[in-house]
């Protein structure tokens, strides 16, 4: 029996009944929340093999092991995860082992065990042998292993029945409890899974099987699951359905889920039953269960009740994120804000079309209209008294409106009205005039000449590079001398730069008034001598990058009524040199045989340019003879082995404490300072633990229903 | 794989009330879905008295609105039928159902409930 | 309440021969989404309904293609191009565009 769409169940314990029929949870499983112990002992689910999105246990009180509820789980999917974890274990006060010893593979997502005080069997069990990569696993703040005494079944009477594999260059016994082994398959089967008798399943099984290559016969799919058998892909006229099974056209049609209740329903694309159609996608008619590739971005039509949108605040302008068309006006009233300009970029880039008008006034944070980077149609069929459809009123940072060079953008009604945008120079506001289709319209007092710009310096002068020079962390450039007709009237030059991958930025991205800027500035005097050209040495850049660099002149921006010339460059795209990459990351060497290791590694998180190959070095190490000094089969602490570089974490040592030995110097000395990187490192794992910690409680702490 | 399954008195007396519950497995009566009641005078047609959706708002035939009630307990995953001041013309069998978007998917056995003294 | 009509109310039948079933409602049952969600369902004896068409003519994935479904606005039609014994049972239209939702008042298919 599938059960779905996910199941949560919380402060009864009895609710664990509604399990009873289910082989596959189609959907998540959360068990949470239940604080009176209680014996589990009666609850047991054999029919349970398989959940296809996440398992979540979260403080359940009196649960000591998964292994007698789950005796078969078998595979856990991941097709949605929760906080990029298929399982997840946290704050479960009394579980003392896992013991999910049928538990044969987690498809995507890793695993999260944390803060559960009393649980072991954690070092026993080879996640790698379930996961595909385990360096995601967060497993932290559990039982420490040395209070644990871990057993593998047999191991006791010296007689052990478990495999053993290596972890951390620690080949041991894999186990799950103190009686169940973890199961490993014979290496003859590849990546297929087995039966309980060691027979090869059949390709298309995942997990295990009830009988040798047999594609009925297995417990879970490895691909999909249609009519009883597994299959590697969906039959014709049927698709995939939530990452696991084949349905037909009429179950896809009459999905009536709570997620999904505001949409139009499910649609069928690319041989998938889904949502929503995919990004660049919409339906080919509204209630169409088909989709069409959009032509740009996908348009999404927005209204506002009240028929005027304010936006003033991030808030404000979250509720646009995603539309295209917004049926309505704008009226745009931005006074201060953090980050602004990139954040109203963020959720009202999209914006193509305004049916309505558009209104910017008392906007004193913003310095460019270039966050509706996508705007090019304002309709004006609602227009302000004076029929104007475009108005900018006392905006006192406002210096750009859009980049003209790359922007296309129709006022089809109404007129624009302009005043009191001290930084806004006339002649923008000219060009804007002839982009839109508006000249002519407006009349003289539209466009106020005397009060927009009287504060810019609005005649700009091109200043010309004269040479770059780079190396892997520096870029020396220097430029053409400005000599404004006044010499007193030039202060400095300003230097701006930021990383660029591409080469499509412009001056005032990121930029707002409240002091946000994703652009660098670095001021530069006047060289003294009069024939030396004015340069700079931009340093501690990143090897083998991309970064736009601009120089602007610092002028006088007023002399008495009369506008003066400023200057500024082009955007100049200048790459520094390639240097060494640091180190690859997640090496993990393991043995397969008794003369080969496979070492796997990550690529540097640094390149620094293009990787063309890696440089693999080994030696022979001397056998260590500590590890034979130590009875192995007692339960006392068992020694962590001894790393490479020779130190061992001095709680782990069972005889005598030696002082830790510090720098050079032989003798006793304190313990060596922890350096600015493990300082930082360790602030973001305590910020990575708090805000994992928040998405759990937002996630399932919610109002009681009814 | 969804099963619903009707369960109440056989037995009803005139003007007391009829209380019916279905009991919902394989699917969470939250997670989606319209969750109706419809019954079936013996020999004669179907009649749809109400709905409780997902969300647990109700939808319920006029003529039947002001005796009907259908309301659901989301920890068994049932839902049920109270239909007040019954009459024999109340005699019917009942059948719980769900539907989803566009049509009834999934139906009970019905259960026959007679209004009788 | 929309009412629909169906008719004939009894059908009697021979193996192997056409059969047609009509379905009228009092008003036009398009939804404002623009879709008319009219279903047809076969009740066998002793059992609970089961859907055969939906949204006027979509037969449903396993149901014989010998079953159609045609017609707009007000009429529509359940057509059998050829009756076999199984088919004998029930037939009821249903509108699930407007609440209340309702049936019509069945036609009785029987072997002559």
């Known amino acids: 029996e599938i059960c779905g769409p996910g199941i949560d169940i919380r402060n009864d314990y009895q609710q664990l009944k509604r399990l009873e029929n289910c082989t596959v949870i189609e959907g998540y499983l959360h068990i949470l929340l239940i604080s009176k112990a209680e014996d589990y002992r009666s609850y047991r689910f054999p029919k349970l093999t398989v959940i296809t999105e996440y398992l979540l246990l979260f403080r359940v009180a009196g649960l000591e092991s998964l292994g007698d509820l789950f005796p078969n789980l078998t595979v856990i999917r991941g097709w949605k995860l929760f906080y990029n974890y298929a399982l997840v274990i946290f704050e479960m006060t009394n579980l003392k082992d896992i013991g999910l010893y049928n538990l044969r593979n987690i498809t995507r997502g890793a695993i999260r065990i944390e803060k559960n005080a009393d649980l072991c069997y954690l070092s026993t069990v080879d996640w790698s042998l379930i996961l595909d990569a385990v360096s995601n696993n967060y497993i932290v703040g559990n039982k420490p292993p040395k209070e644990c005494g871990d057993l593998c079944p047999g191991t006791m009477e010296e007689k052990p029945m478990c495999e053993k594999t290596t972890i951390n260059n620690e080949y041991n016994y894999r186990c799950w409890t103190t009686n169940r082994c973890q199961k490993m398959c014979p290496s003859t089967c590849g990546k297929r899974a087995c039966t309980e008798n060691n027979e090869c399943c059949h390709p298309e099984c995942l997990g295990s099987c009830s009988a040798p290559d047999n594609d009925t016969a297995c417990v879970a799919c490895r691909h999909y699951y249609y009519a009883g058998v597994c299959v590697p892909a969906c039959p014709p006229n049927t698709y995939r359905f939530e990452g696991w099974r084949c349905v037909d056209r009429d179950f896809c049609a009459n999905i009536l889920s709570a997620e999904s209740s505001d949409s139009e329903g499910f649609v069928i694309h690319d041989g998938e039953c889904m949502q929503e159609c995919p990004s660049g996608f919409i339906r080919n008619g509204s209630q169409s269960m088909y989709c069409i590739p959009c032509e740009g971005p996908c348009p999404k039509v927005c209204e506002e009740e009240k028929k005027t949108k304010t936006i003033d605040s991030v808030t404000s302008a979250q509720m646009l994120q995603g539309c295209t068309i917004f049926k309505g006006n704008l009226l745009i009233n931005i006074r201060r804000g953090n980050n602004i300009a990139s954040e109203l970029e963020n959720f009202m880039g999209l914006i193509e079309v305004v049916t309505g008008y558009v209104k910017i006034r008392h906007s004193h944070a913003l310095v460019s209209l270039s966050f509706l980077k996508n705007l090019r149609l304002i309709l004006g069929e609602e227009q302000l008294e004076g029929n104007y459809s475009f108005y900018v009123l006392d905006n006192q940072n406002l210096q750009q409106l859009w980049d003209w060079d790359h922007r296309n953008l129709t006022i089809k009604a109404g007129k624009m009205y302009f005043a009191f945008n001290p930084k806004l120079c006339v002649s923008e506001i000219y060009r804007m005039e002839e982009v839109t289709g508006t000249k002519g319209r407006q009349s003289k007092g539209d466009i106020n000449t005397r009060n927009n710009g009287e504060r810019a310096s609005c005649e700009s002068d091109v200043l010309h590079f004269t040479s770059t020079t780079t190396s892997k962390n520096r870029i020396i450039i220097t430029w053409h001398r400005y000599r404004p007709p006044d010499y007193r009237d030039l202060i400095s030059f300003t230097v701006y730069y930021k990383e660029a991958p591409f080469k499509n930025v412009t001056e005032y991205d990121g930029q707002d008034a409240c002091g946000s800027n994703s652009w660098n500035m670095v001021d530069v005097d006047l060289p003294p001598n009069k024939d030396v050209e004015p340069g700079i040495l931009l340093h501690g850049l990143k090897p083998w990058t991309q970064y736009a660099v601009y120089v602007k002149a610092v002028t006088l921006t007023m002399v008495e009524n009369d506008h003066i010339r400023g200057a500024k460059s082009e955007i100049l795209y200048i790459r520094t040199n390639a240097s060494v990459p640091s180190i690859p990351l997640d090496v993990l060497s393991a043995s397969n045989s008794s003369s080969q290791l496979i070492v796997k590694w990550n690529p540097p998180s640094l390149p620094n340019g293009n990787l063309s190959y890696y440089i693999v070095r080994w030696q022979r190490q001397p056998q260590d003879g500590y590890l034979y000094r130590h009875n192995y089969c007692s339960k006392d602490k068992i020694p962590i082995r001894k790393y490479a570089d020779g130190t061992i974490d001095i709680e782990e040592v069972t005889e005598n404490p030696k002082t830790e030995v510090c720098g050079g110097e032989k003798g006793p000395c304190c313990a060596c300072p922890k350096t600015e990187a493990e300082k930082q490192a360790e602030k973001e794992e305590a910020e990575y633990r708090k805000v994992f910690e928040n998405f759990l409680h937002n996630s399932i702490f919610v109002p009681r229903p009814e | 794989q969804v099963q619903l399954q009707e369960s109440g008195p056989g037995l009803v007396k005139p003007s007391e009330t009829l209380s019916l519950t279905c009991t919902v497995s394989?699917?969470?009566?939250?997670?989606?879905?319209?969750w109706n009641w419809i019954r079936q005078p013996p020999g004669k047609g179907l009649e749809w008295i109400g709905y409780i959706s997902y969300d647990g708002t109700n939808n319920y035939k006029p003529s039947l609105k002001d005796r009907v009630t259908i309301s659901r307990d989301t920890s068994k995953n049932q839902f049920s039928l109270k239909l007040s001041s019954v009459t024999a013309a109340d005699t019917a069998v009942y059948y719980c159902?769900?539907?989803?978007?566009?049509?009834?998917?999934?139906w009970g056995q019905g259960t026959l409930v007679t209004v009788s003294s | 309440d929309i009412v629909m009509t169906q008719s004939p109310l009894s059908l009697p039948v021979t193996p192997g021969e056409p059969a047609s079933i009509s379905c009228r409602s009092s008003?036009?049952?398009?939804?404002?989404?623009?879709?008319?969600?009219l279903q047809w369902y076969l009740q066998k004896p002793g059992q609970s309904p089961q859907l055969l068409i939906y949204?006027?003519?979509n037969r449903l994935y396993g149901v014989p293609d010998r079953f159609s479904g045609s017609g707009s606005g007000t009429d529509f039609t359940l057509k059998i191009s050829r009756v076999e014994a199984e088919d004998v049972g029930v037939y009821y239209c249903f509108q699930g565009s407007h609440v209340p939702w309702t049936f019509g008042q069945g036609t009785k298919v029987e072997i002559k």
């Open positions: 159902a769900r539907h989803g978007r566009v049509f009834f998917d999934y």
């Open positions: 394989g699917y969470s009566i939250t997670g989606g879905y319209l």
């Open positions: 949204k006027v003519s």
């Open positions: 008003q036009s049952i398009v939804h404002s989404n623009g879709n008319t969600y």
